[in-house]
């Protein structure tokens, strides 16, 4: 059966609707759409002839209708007047007609609503407020939201006037919220801007802060009063009943015992006309002066001097406290406190003892802190370091050496070459060096305060030819599967390539081998006995190359599980028993034997002449490597048979 479906059924003004035709018959001549529930030539919208694929507008055509070849009708830019029924008239090829009617409803796009109120400043526990959602719109549903949530269930909330009006009875401060209304129809939904309900309330009983009621003489008294109130409360202060000032905060500097008494804060709300008060009792105590630290040595020398810090003034029956680096005193044999804790002595000061140091005097209420004191510990100079670390240079380059030594006060520096003083600077610069600049370069650091001097000597070689390198190692006897070894190719030279060989071959690819420091350092991680090879490093530049002597890595390993030989376990009575134990180990292990758990001899070979069945039992060989700290053992069972009772047995050695 021919049917018409409207998509959508409810259409918004300005949008479009499609009258979709279902079950269209076969063999058609054409079809026509009409406004209304019947075929009426005066209300024809559009016709369509299939043979010519030609659409023809009718008297009711508005310019907004488009007919599809499948007879469906699209209407654009819908207006309110389009609401209603539409009839499709189908003409078959046999000129038999068929009709079907569809309909849709048009609704306006709703405007954004707004909220009106009958009371902009309701008073808590007294007034009611009625919100109304504007405008009043036909066929619209009204909804309300409080803080973007649907309305809570409450006997104080009432909806009326088709939900257009929301009344709040006996408002409270908790009703101070964001209120929105929403209008809905079948094609649109719009929410208003939020309206914040301004509920007048309070003042509640004020709170005075801070809560502490005990103060020391000389302190500042700073009291703050706060009472929940809308609009904000106006505040007044009274001391012992006498009006002081109309402020939220009361400030009295440098208080004395005379400022003790009752302090009253009064809060007043001019809109509600209410007053509330709170009273606090303040007690002011006499107080000792602020402590300070004196020192018997303001510039102590490291590892030489002791320093005694004393907390002043001396007050009877007072507890003295100390802090270093804002922490309580650490336990240290170099820190000593006097019996009354007033003097802190630092024995043999170090550069790490600079502080800051604070002392404190404890009274009934709190602890008074001194200002911090920092010690100026004189130290150094430490052994100076010369950088860069290169010892080999090519002729023609610039030599720039820098010297640094930890020192307080900062060190004064001098440079000597082959024992001859050059200059009193921290840096030494020689341009365009030649072989003649080779020699011993000494940096001397001097601390004028302590009178100490330290020197460092560096050998500088200037040569076009590279020197024969050597290999240094951080671990001469590494333990297998435990240690790493770092080989370094010496010397460090500028513009030089470093190469490595193992057993005369270039380095194998291995995750345990790592080159660093510009290939100058070769690290072997988790060494194994197979790493005990000959290692050679080479250096080369554009004019020369040289190789080091080989260094053989001595890997400590084992002992592995020992092997007892011969393997025989059955012997004839009267034979000689000659057992030899061997375990792979570097260095060679120490051997010991146990028979049936009883210690025997500390030899690699166990020899027993003319054995008897009494020599039956378990023979254990124990091996230990003192260098690796590891041990191992193996147990062998020996059976001795009487002569001639067990053919085929070994005759022994």
């Amino acid at each position: 059966k021919l049917t018409i479906e409207s998509t959508p059924f409810n259409v918004a003004e300005g949008k479009e609707v499609l009258l979709l035709v279902h079950n269209l018959p076969q063999h058609l001549f054409g079809y026509s759409w009409y406004k209304g529930e019947r075929v009426d030539g005066n209300r024809q919208i559009i016709g369509y002839v299939i043979g010519t694929q030609q659409a023809t507008p009718g008297p009711a055509y508005s310019g907004r209708e488009i007919i599809y070849p499948n007879a469906s009708l699209l209407i654009q830019n819908i207006i309110q007047n389009d609401t209603g029924f539409y009839t499709l008239h189908v003409i078959k090829s046999d000129l038999v007609n068929e009709e079907a009617t569809g309909q849709f409803r048009v609704y306006p796009e709703l405007p954004k609503p707004s909220i009106s109120s009958n009371n902009s400043k309701p008073v808590e526990d007294k007034d009611a407020v009625a919100f109304t959602c504007e405008p009043e719109t036909q066929d619209a549903t009204y909804l309300w939201w409080v803080n973007n949530q649907s309305l809570p269930v409450s006997p104080r909330l009432q909806l009326s006037n088709g939900n257009r009006t929301l009344t709040l009875f006996n408002v409270t401060r908790n009703d101070t919220a964001s209120y929105k209304c929403e209008t809905q129809n079948p094609v649109s939904a719009r929410r208003s801007d939020s309206v914040i309900l301004n509920v007048l309330y309070g003042p509640d009983a004020p709170t005075i802060s801070p809560l502490n009621t005990s103060y020391r003489s000389g302190e500042n008294l700073n009291l703050s009063c706060h009472a929940a109130s809308n609009p904000p409360a106006q505040y007044s202060w009274f001391v012992n009943g006498t009006f002081q000032q109309s402020t939220q905060e009361l400030f009295i500097p440098n208080i004395t015992v005379n400022n003790s008494g009752s302090y009253t804060c009064q809060a007043h709300n001019s809109d509600t006309g209410l007053n509330r008060t709170t009273v606090t009792t303040i007690t002011v105590y006499a107080e000792p002066p602020k402590p300070f630290i004196t020192s018997n040595n303001s510039n102590p020398v490291e590892d030489e001097d002791a320093v005694a810090l004393t907390c002043e003034p001396e007050i009877q029956n007072t507890t003295y406290l100390w802090w270093v680096n804002n922490q309580s005193l650490p336990v240290s044999p170099r820190l000593q406190l006097s019996n009354d804790n007033r003097t802190l002595t630092l024995l043999s000061v170090t550069r790490n003892d600079v502080g800051p140091y604070e002392c404190g005097i404890q009274n009934e209420l709190s602890v008074d802190h001194s200002d911090p004191v920092i010690l100026n510990v004189l130290y150094g100079p430490d052994d100076p370091t010369i950088s860069p670390s290169y010892t080999y240079y090519r002729p023609g380059v610039n030599l720039s050496l820098s010297c640094h030594a930890a020192s307080n006060p900062p060190a004064q520096y001098s440079w000597l070459i082959d024992g001859n003083i050059q200059q009193h600077t921290q840096e030494l610069f020689i341009s365009n060096i030649t072989e003649k600049n080779s020699g011993l370069y000494t940096c001397q650091a001097n601390n004028s305060a302590s009178g100490h001097s330290r020197t460092t000597v560096k050998t500088i070689t200037v040569s076009a030819e590279l020197p024969k390198p050597s290999i240094s190692s951080n671990n001469s006897k590494p333990v297998e599967d435990k240690d790493a070894v770092a080989f370094t190719c010496e010397p460090e030279a500028q513009n030089t390539t470093y190469l490595w060989w193992v057993n005369g071959q270039s380095l194998p690819v291995s995750p345990r081998l790592q080159l660093s420091n510009g290939n100058r350092t070769l690290t072997l991680f988790n060494v194994t006995r197979n790493d005990a090879r000959a290692y050679v490093c080479g250096i080369q530049n554009s004019v020369s190359a040289n190789r080091s002597d080989p260094v053989t890595l001595d890997v400590l390993y084992g002992p592995d599980t020992p092997i007892i030989s011969p393997p025989d376990s059955s012997y004839l009575s009267g034979a000689n028993l000659n057992l030899s134990c061997h375990s792979a180990s570097n260095p060679s292990p120490q051997y010991s034997w146990r028979i049936n758990g009883i210690p025997q001899q500390h030899t690699q070979v166990l020899f027993i002449a003319k054995i008897t069945p009494n020599n039956n039992g378990t023979y254990a060989c124990f091996v230990s490597n003192l260098a690796t700290g590891r041990n191992n053992s193996i147990v062998k069972s020996i059976t001795v048979s009487a002569s001639g009772t067990s053919p085929g047995l070994s005759a022994g050695a």
Partner: nanobody
Framework: EVQLVESGGGLVQPGGSLRLSCAAS????????IGWVRRAPGKEEELVAG????????RYADSVKGRFTISADTSKNTAYLQMNSLRAEDTAVYYC????????????WGQGTTVTVSS
Amino acid sequence: EVQLVESGGGLVQPGGSLRLSCAASGFNIKDTCIGWVRRAPGKEEELVAGICEYTGSTRYADSVKGRFTISADTSKNTAYLQMNSLRAEDTAVYYCAIVSQSRSVYNYWGQGTTVTVSS
């Protein structure tokens, strides 16, 4: 009576320009979407451009984007198609049509105006 009357066609050399007009009567073009459809022998009918005055939107076929511009003068109830950089493949009969804003459907019933692009 509802009518769409096209004009402005003619012979033009490749690279030349033409301006087609579509005079509507019996309805207001400001309430609907109006456009241009072209038919050429051996080719599929193509909706080349459309304008919806009530939304202010326009649409173009990829083949004419950047070359053709559709516009409307609601006071004259007339739509226009400015055709620039014309090519031989633009040769066709151009019909003024009622078009959909969002779908690929349209109706036309005028006589059309012929555009020939040839050197």
